[in-house]
Each structure stands twice: as C-alpha cells, then as structure tokens.
C-alpha cells in the first residue's frame, strides 16, 4: 500500500505491486552467504545461519545452496529474484513454503538448491523425498 | 481504526543521530509486525527494519545493519527507530507501517496501515 502521499517512481524494482496496486511486503530470509557446513546424509538440516535479512527487493524469494566435493561440504543462504538464474539454474520451487533441495548437476560436486517463499524458510532445507511433490502417494494426499 | 504518526524527522549533519517514533491510536497493536519504510527523493520504497510484536526480534536491510534500532513500546503503541551515523544516503522521508500475520500484500492509500511519513535530511 503506498498511501497516495507516497510519490510514484518509474521503473523502480523496489515496489512490487498486484493487480490491485497493493504493495508486497519484503521477504525475510537467512542470509549467510557461503558457511561451511556439516549438513550430510540427512532427511533435513537447519541452515545454522543466525543472520535473518530484509530481502532488498520485494519480489526475491529464499534461497539455500548446499554443495559437496572432495574438501568440504558448503551452505549457502540468500535473497534472489526467480525471474534470474542463480547458479545459472532457474528457481522453479520459488512458490514453495517450504525448501525443498533437489540435485543440479555440476561437474566435480554434488550441488542441491532449494528455493521458497515464506519467512526464513531457507533455515529448514529438506532433502527428504517424503517432501517431494513428485511422489504420486504426496499428490494423492494432498488432493484428497 | 488505528492510525499511525510519525514523528522525529529534521536537518542533521553527517555522523549524526536522530530517533524517531510512530505512535499508534487502537488497540491492535500488539497483534502487529512493525516496519520502518523509506522513500528518498525520486526513489521508490527501501524496507528498513522491522519487529515482531512479541518477542521483540528484529530485521534489518543491509544498508542500515549496525547504525539504526528498532524498538517498541507495546504499553504506548509506539514504534522507534534509533538511527545513528547517519549518512547523505539516509535522506528520506521514513513511514511507519504494520503487517499482520500472513499478510504479503497491503492495499494502496491504507492510512489504517501507513503513516504520513516524518523526512529527515542528513547534510552538512
């Protein structure tokens, strides 16, 4: 909502509007950049991130990053718009309330990504297949 | 309805500080998220800093992480902002505004959810 007071700009990325001319509250996601990490063959992991940022733009959805190689294990957590590549993959779970990981293929690692769009939802990355709307018997579930 | 105001804003030289507050009439309050908003002169809106009504926890952008607080006072329905080592790039006009629980969108000329807005001017 900008009050009529509230001067317009053009071509301004830092008001997002509906159809209605509403105004879009800002996420606010975990936002740690690259932090080793000790996430490893489990169904879910808290980001361990105690950095909860404004989002600069109202459009940008959370985003977690979890990548290993023969060295370390990395989690990456931050702000980006789904209408841009990160990582040079698209985000296409940026609607999800919840982060779901799934693999990307990179050579020399194993690289995951997750993105959603609900408060600090970066902070719980799920790499369960239970959460993974794929599954034919979740679909059931959740259709019924 | 409640309806927010915004006071504190004024002229204030480079490394400077200036604390501003927005009182809220109603009762609602407390069920409230608060926010900081600013909209410098030809820009659009920068979220600044917001709190949760309980449990007080605080987000900041990153432009203003570790120079401004926000704080409120849920006895006065009041909402603060200690903004310090202020800067040129502060220049704005500052609103408060309030989000419930959920709520991803406020629709445009809400006074129940904007205040008028308070400029402060950071010049030497």
């Known amino acids: 909502t900008i009050p009529p007071h509230v001067q317009k700009s053009v071509n301004n990325d830092m008001i997002v509007t509906d159809n209605n001319g509403a105004v879009k509250f800002p996420q606010l996601c975990k936002f740690c950049d690259v932090r080793f990490s000790t996430c490893d063959n489990q169904k879910s992991c808290m980001s361990n991130c105690s950095i909860t940022s404004i989002c600069e733009k109202p459009q940008e959805v959370c985003v977690a990053v979890w990548r290993k190689n023969d060295e370390n294990i990395t989690l990456e957590t931050v702000c980006h718009d789904p209408k841009l590549p990160y990582h040079d993959f698209i985000l296409e779970d940026a609607a999800s309330p919840k982060c779901i990981m799934k693999e990307k293929k990179k050579p020399g690692e194993t690289f995951f990504m997750c993105s959603c769009s609900s408060d600090e939802c970066n902070d719980n990355i799920i790499f369960s297949e239970e959460y993974n709307t794929s599954n034919p018997d979740l679909l059931l579930v959740i259709f019924q | 309805e409640v309806q927010l105001l915004e006071s504190g804003g004024g002229l204030v030289q480079p490394g400077g500080s200036l604390r501003l507050s927005c009182a809220a009439s109603g009762s609602t309050f407390t069920e409230y998220r608060m926010w900081w908003v600013r909209q410098a002169p030809g820009k659009g809106l920068e979220w600044v800093s917001?709190?949760?009504?309980?449990?007080?926890?605080?987000y900041y952008a990153n432009s203003v992480k570790g120079r401004f607080t926000i704080s409120r006072d849920n006895s006065k329905n009041t909402l603060y902002l200690q903004m310090n080592s202020l800067r040129a790039e502060d220049t704005a006009v500052y609103y408060c505004?309030?989000?419930?629980?959920?709520?991803?969108?406020?629709?445009?000329?809400?006074?129940?959810?904007w205040g008028q807005g308070t400029l402060v001017t950071v010049s030497s």
């Open positions: 917001a709190i949760e009504p309980i449990g007080h926890r605080t």
């Open positions: 505004a309030k989000q419930a629980p959920n709520q991803r969108y406020v629709a445009r000329g809400r006074l129940d959810y």
